[in-house]
Interface confidence: low
């Protein structure tokens, strides 16, 4: 069971990143699915290595003082959402914006029907060029 | 099937990073090989988690305006090269240069004879000290 | 065999980061253990994917000129410690400090009784908020 999906620009104002099965994507079988273009949902319980990479372009003057934060989040059936992993990068002083990349990854137990998704502080700053932003998992 | 190879400074002007089986490297068996010191080639088709870490030292004034970009690329037999993953970091203002690290990783299907390699915008900026820059894969 | 442990603030002045089995941690079975809150020790020989993520907050003026470095280290029975992976990030100019995240990961052969741990240049700069700093491994 493995998946690797590719970022997709979205007109939605939500902080949850959007993904697509496009380009050099992976979707090994129907035991993992991309739902609503926003979350990877697994049908089998077990340990998974889950990862995400987010490249963004921001400028200190044009952004809030708070850093750019990417969060890998879990929603299990009947449970609250919870943060599994987070990474933060302070905005660049480069003009018009400075690119930076964040990588998240870890081993987590998922229940049947659990979904994982990626939140960012400002989706408009995310880079969607080939290979820059992606999300995936593999079952151990 | 797994490999982990260590960066090697090169006098070549190519943007493709050079690697060696040295230090605490891994080469599990002959189903994965390091070819010409530049690419990991697999003999078996399947899903692989492929990763690379690149540490570099650059200065905004001494570099081009474009960010430092590391790309994980795929060459399948009889096919064009393609970018699997990329990460970008804006140059530092630290003098003489500021170190930064990039990590790339994802799950991809490889065909028999497929090779993966790492490209960077400026190989002269890459740090080759112990553990700073490495490249590997594992078959799921 | 898999583990994922969560960073813990420590009053110790050691450069070795402290970890805990708390929050959404993983400890698959007793073939991997967290010892003294500082190292993951494995009982079985084999290839492991080992990873660490460290988020830190630093300021160029308040820090030494040297970058913030995170190192993934190995201690095998009867052997000296050795560095497996390192990543470096130059300090931010943001006030009071600028957050940055480092991700390390690679495939390594471990002997029975081998331990892995994470060293940083300044543990007081590490961010311990939910999900920011973690450490883990999985046996291939």
């Amino acid at each position: 069971i493995a998946a690797h999906v590719i970022s997709e620009a979205s007109s939605k104002t939500t902080s949850v990143l959007q993904w697509a099965e496009k380009g050099y994507y992976t979707m090994s079988n129907n035991l993992v699915t991309l739902e609503n273009g926003k979350q990877l949902t697994v049908k089998r319980q077990g340990l998974y290595y889950i990862y995400a990479q987010v490249t963004f372009c921001s400028n200190r003057e044009a952004s809030s003082q708070a850093p750019f934060i990417a969060s890998l989040c879990l929603k299990s059936p009947g449970r609250f959402e919870r943060i599994l992993l987070r990474a933060a990068n302070t905005h660049s002083s480069a003009k018009p914006c400075g690119q930076q990349s964040i990588h998240l990854g870890g081993v987590f137990e998922l229940q049947p029907g659990a979904s994982v998704f990626v939140n960012v502080t400002d989706p408009s700053q995310v880079s969607h060029g080939t290979g820059f932003t992606s999300f995936g998992l593999l079952k151990l | 099937i797994a490999a982990h190879v260590i960066s090697e400074a090169s006098s070549k002007t190519t943007s493709v990073l050079q690697w060696a089986e040295k230090g605490y490297y891994t080469m599990s068996n002959n189903l994965v090989t390091l070819e010409n010191g530049k690419q990991l080639t697999v003999k078996r088709q399947g899903l692989y988690y492929i990763y690379a870490q690149v540490t570099f030292c650059s200065n905004r004034e001494a570099s081009s305006q474009a960010p430092f970009i590391a790309s994980l690329c795929l060459k399948s037999p009889g096919r064009f090269e393609r970018i699997l993953l990329r990460a970008a970091n804006t140059h530092s203002s630290a003098k003489p240069c500021g170190q930064q690290s990039i990590h790339l990783g994802g799950v991809f299907e490889l065909q028999p004879g497929a090779s993966v390699f790492v490209n960077v915008t400026d190989p002269s900026q890459v740090s080759h000290g112990t553990g700073f820059t490495s490249f590997g894969l594992l078959k799921l | 065999i898999a583990a994922h442990v969560i960073s813990e603030a420590s009053s110790k002045t050691t450069s070795v980061l402290q970890w805990a089995e708390k929050g959404y941690y993983t400890m698959s079975n007793n073939l991997v253990t967290l010892e003294n809150g500082k190292q993951l020790t494995v009982k079985r020989q084999g290839l492991y994917y080992i990873y660490a993520q460290v988020t830190f907050c630093s300021n160029r003026e308040a820090s030494s000129q040297a970058p913030f470095i995170a190192s993934l280290c190995l201690k095998s029975p009867g052997r000296f410690e050795r560095i497996l992976l390192r990543a470096a990030n130059t300090h931010s100019s943001a006030k009071p400090c600028g957050q940055q995240s480092i991700h390390l990961g690679g495939v390594f052969e471990l002997q029975p009784g081998a331990s892995v741990f994470v060293n940083v240049t300044d543990p007081s700069q590490v961010s311990h908020g939910t999900g920011f700093t973690s450490f883990g491994l999985l046996k291939l």
Epitope: Q45, G46, L47, E109 | - | G23, T26, S28
Partner: antibody, heavy 119, light 111 residues
């Protein structure tokens, strides 16, 4: 150390409501769920529901959905449970309890609040 | 909802002997890695106290004479050797899916 301090015993009339409190100390209140558990005299334990103190989200045992309302006051690190339309079936000791990490074993318990419904 | 059935409902054991309490779940509460079953001790007038988490992991500060085992649907709490202070009611509880439920309890008396 972690402590959960609950409000005192209540004697209430049928049809009335009661609001129980649970003040947490010794840990970061917003980092953990708060659970509520019911125990009728001489009986077993029943899980009522849970609240996420960070955002106030709740989940309930279906049997208590129309009976209990869970709230928190983050500024005072206090969780509340209001029980409405009380009947003799609601006479019980009510415990607030904090789960262990994310895995939901209940490692810290309040001393309990006794509620007696009687006319 | 997952139903937990404890047996026996009550148990009398001589000092120094072994007490065994069983808990059966109406469906599996174990994954490949964890069993989401926990055991509590409750003495009269006191709140429950966590003894064992995840079927077999002894909670900090709990005497080693308490042990837990099992996976899937069948779980066991053992106390050996039983001491006088172990007189109490013991409950199992699962955390597999909402709502969490408890077993009906087993009352242990020391002879």
């Amino acid at each position: 150390q972690v402590q959960l301090q609950q409000s005192g015993a209540e004697l209430v009339k049928p049809g009335a409501s009661v609001k129980l409190s649970c003040k947490a100390s010794g840990y970061t209140f917003t980092r953990y769920y708060m659970f509520w558990v019911k125990q009728r005299p001489g009986q077993g334990l029943e899980w009522i529901g849970e609240i996420n103190p960070t955002n106030g989200d709740t989940n309930f045992n279906e049997e208590f959905k129309s009976k209990a309302t869970l709230t928190v006051d983050k500024s005072s690190s206090t969780a509340y449970m209001q029980l409405s339309s009380l009947t003799s079936e609601d006479s019980a000791v009510y415990y607030c309890t904090r789960p262990l990490g994310s895995r939901d074993a209940m490692d810290y318990w309040g001393p309990g609040t006794s509620v007696t419904v009687s006319s | 909802d997952i139903v937990l059935t404890q047996s026996p409902a009550s148990l009398a054991v001589s000092l120094g002997q072994r007490a065994t309490i069983s808990c059966r779940a109406s469906q599996s509460v174990s994954s490949s890695r964890y069993s989401y079953m926990h055991w509590y001790q409750q003495k009269p007038g006191q709140p429950p106290k966590l003894l064992i988490k995840y079927a077999s992991s002894l909670e900090s500060g709990v005497p080693a004479r308490f042990s837990g085992s099992g996976s899937g649907t069948d779980f066991t709490l053992n106390i050996h050797p039983v001491e006088g202070e172990d007189t109490a009611t013991y409950y199992c509880q699962h955390s597999w899916e909402l709502p969490w439920t408890f077993g009906g309890g087993t009352k242990l008396e020391i002879k």
